[in-house]
């Protein structure tokens, strides 16, 4: 058993048929010595008396809010949550496996630049009685500070018969050094509580590996005289790290016909312009990627040819 | 470059960008099979990193690029030694199309651009590499190349910025 926060405790249980469970001793937070009784949740049934209560925690029915009273007055509470371990593996019932980039990916994170700011998100099908708390650091043995906000519900989607809820959190490294080569990864820890079930999820990454620039901005076409060619131009996204002579991007320019089956013409360039042939009803798209480190490409910025 | 003269920023830029490309193309081509039960004990902790105080940020380069260039030079020599060690020359053989050889030669080329014959910087003591067990080598290659990708990315940014803003 360990304390998650004041008056909230997590009991770690090996979950298998006829498991003996964990013996837990609760102590009433009071100077009183006698006349103390214990109840669980809203029940008025007295579970025991005395300053301490010993219980055998085997299942969710044994978890909940234990309260000690004296003469009708509440003295203190202890909320017991369960953390299940089945076949040596902690349960992951609350969050959905996003399976990208690999199986058992519950948390996904992205950064728009090297400033030390990043966003993480996760998915669940649970809509009520759900709380999240997020902590982060750079490194684990001698952790350096990363400050995370509160997790918020950022999207709701219908997937078949199910509703899916996306939560996200923004974090900022306290003393970020954008130009340095990271040697210690960022660690993100999410505590998830659904009713009386506790689970924790972690992710470890370098900012460089989760970089995904915003799409290029101000995408424009300039027709070239007496030609089917156009000059496409664009700018670095506002959110990208500066100076651009140091934090450089590379770009992919694509000409795509109306039909998905039509052949795509692609050009790669380090410049912020390119000359391409504009076909009727086609569109021109541009996306960006760090020039020197192959992290994710941005989403496409697009304009129609006409 | 040792002693304060300027490097050939544009040449360094071109070669460092080539190094980035090679480091990424070498990464999947490091052995005969997938990484599997090799375990994840930390094996590349001792590689030199370009850290916050090394003056490799735009402001530090403007103030005095020598600190940063020396750091990059140390790293290039370090990785050049690693790529020549039995981690890469031993079994499992590199795949026939592996660009590790080109990568190795380019590391040497860039380090020589930064320190021409006859000039000497204090080089960081290269740890003497004890022979590696064949079963460890795939994981070591994987980690070294991942680490090298990060190192050369920073070096390439430095030279790109230098070529754009510090070239005579």
């Amino acid at each position: 058993i360990w304390e998650l926060k004041k008056d909230v405790y997590v009991v770690e249980l090996d979950w298998y048929p006829d498991a003996p469970g964990e013996m837990v001793v609760l102590t009433c937070d009071t100077p009183e010595e006698d006349g103390i009784t214990w109840t669980l949740d809203q029940s008025s049934e007295v579970l025991g008396s005395g300053k301490t209560l010993t219980i055998q925690v085997k299942e969710f029915g044994d978890a909940g809010q234990y309260t000690c009273h004296k003469g009708g007055e509440v003295l203190s509470h202890s909320l017991l949550l369960l953390h299940k371990k089945e076949d040596g593996i902690w349960s992951t019932d609350i969050l959905k496996d996003q399976k990208e980039p690999k199986n058992k990916t519950f948390l996904r994170c992205e950064a728009k630049n090297y400033s030390g700011r990043f966003t993480c998100w996760w998915l669940t099908t649970i809509s009520t009685d759900l709380t999240f708390s997020v902590k982060s650091s750079r490194g684990s043995s001698d952790p350096q500070g990363v400050t995370c906000g509160a997790a918020t519900l950022s999207a709701e989607r219908v997937r078949g018969d199910n509703k899916e809820y996306e939560y996200s959190v923004e974090c900022q490294e306290d003393s970020a050094c954008p130009a340095a080569e990271e040697s210690l990864p960022i660690e993100v820890m999410v505590d998830a509580v659904h009713k009386l079930k506790y689970e924790n999820y972690t992710s470890s990454f370098f900012i460089r590996d989760i970089i995904k620039p915003d799409p290029p901005k101000n995408l424009q076409l300039k027709p070239l005289k007496n030609s089917r060619q156009v000059e496409v131009s664009w700018e670095y996204p506002d959110t990208w790290s500066t100076p651009h002579s140091y934090f450089s991007l590379t770009f992919c320019v694509q000409v795509q016909g109306k039909s998905k089956r039509e052949k795509k013409d692609r050009v790669f360039t380090d410049k912020t312009s390119a000359t391409v042939i504009c076909r009727k009803n086609a569109s021109i798209s541009v996306r960006a990627q760090d020039r020197y480190y192959s992290s994710s490409w941005s989403e496409w910025a697009s304009v129609p040819c006409s | 470059v040792p002693g304060g003269s300027s490097p050939a920023w544009t040449q360094c830029q071109q070669l460092s960008q080539k190094l980035c490309t090679l480091a990424w193309s070498a990464h999947p081509l490091v052995g005969h099979m997938d990484l599997r039960e090799e375990g994840d004990e930390e094996t590349t902790n001792d590689v030199p990193h370009i850290q916050c105080g090394d003056g490799c940020d735009p402001q530090g380069l403007r103030d005095n690029s020598q600190f940063c260039l020396q750091r990059i030079h140390q790293g290039l020599i370090f990785y050049e030694k690693l790529l020549g060690s039995d981690i890469f020359t031993g079994e499992p053989s590199l795949l026939p199309d592996s660009p590790v050889g080109q990568l190795h030669a380019s590391l040497l080329g860039l380090s020589q651009l930064l320190q021409p014959e006859g000039h000497h910087w204090e080089t960081q003591q290269i740890p003497s590499l004890s022979p590696s067990q064949p079963w460890q080598r795939l994981l070591l290659r994987f980690k070294i190349l991942r680490s090298l990708q990060a190192f050369v990315a920073v070096a390439a940014r430095v030279f790109a910025h230098g070529a754009a803003t510090l070239s005579p």
């Epitope: - | 099979m33 599997r36 020549g84 060690s85 050889g101 022979p131 064949p134 079963w135």
Partner: antibody, heavy 115, light 107 residues
């Protein structure tokens, strides 16, 4: 074409030393480790050790430490093995091998230790 | 040291028959196991690398299988020129060790 050309047979007296060579051609010498293997007449194979010609790092089978010394010369793309304090137990064919998984063995050097 | 045990010590086969040679390692060596053929007065020749990977120039009748500590070299239709001693080798960890060999004879 990759070739490993070993030096010729040696007849040596007990207590003496012998140094044999293995000249590599058809590839860049510094890109592969070179193993040495011993085979006594009518018997099996025993690994002696290897050298990485790029940095001259060596690894020996404990059994051959103090007996065998591996060296290399980049300029001539040649690997060497010196055997010291020879006894009749050292009479064998010695092979140089470029990496186990690359199918290149020298033709062997026969060493005969006899008074 | 990892001990490599080969069986049988000698095998006498009729041309055209399929034959299997066994090699056991005293501890797991994953798939870091190589097979060699040595004919009289010749250098050993690599037949199979990493337990099951074929070598260019080696006839397709030679194949390898196994992982961990049990390995097999199969010759699916023995030819008279296959006579010789077959060695397996631990390529996993130091010191590299060889089996004592299986001698293949033709009836």
């Amino acid at each position: 074409e990759v070739q490993l050309q070993q030096s010729g047979p040696e007849l040596v007296k007990p207590g003496a030393s012998v140094k044999m060579s293995c000249k590599a051609s058809g590839y860049t010498f510094t890109t592969s480790i070179m193993h040495w293997v011993k085979q006594k007449p009518g018997q099996g194979l025993e690994w002696i050790g290897y050298i990485n010609p790029y940095d001259d790092v060596t690894k020996y089978n404990e059994k051959f430490k103090g007996k065998a010394t591996l060296t290399s010369d980049k300029s001539s793309s040649t690997a060497y093995m010196e055997l010291s304090s020879l006894t009749s137990e050292d009479s064998a064919v010695y092979y140089c091998v470029r990496r186990w998984d690359e199918a290149y063995w020298g033709q062997g050097t026969l060493v005969t230790v006899s008074a | 040291d990892i001990v490599m045990t080969q069986s049988p010590a000698t095998l006498s086969v009729t041309p055209g028959n399929r034959v299997s040679l066994s090699c056991r390692a005293s501890q797991s060596i994953s798939d870091y196991l190589h097979w060699y053929q040595q004919k009289s007065h010749e250098s050993p020749r690599l037949l199979i690398k990493y337990a099951s990977q074929s070598i260019s120039g080696i006839p397709s009748r030679f194949s390898g299988s196994g992982s961990g500590s049990n390995f097999t070299l199969s010759i699916n239709s023995v030819e008279p020129e296959d006579v010789g001693v077959y060695y397996c080798q631990n390529g996993h960890s130091f010191p590299f060790t060889f089996g004592s060999g299986t001698k293949l004879e033709i009836k």
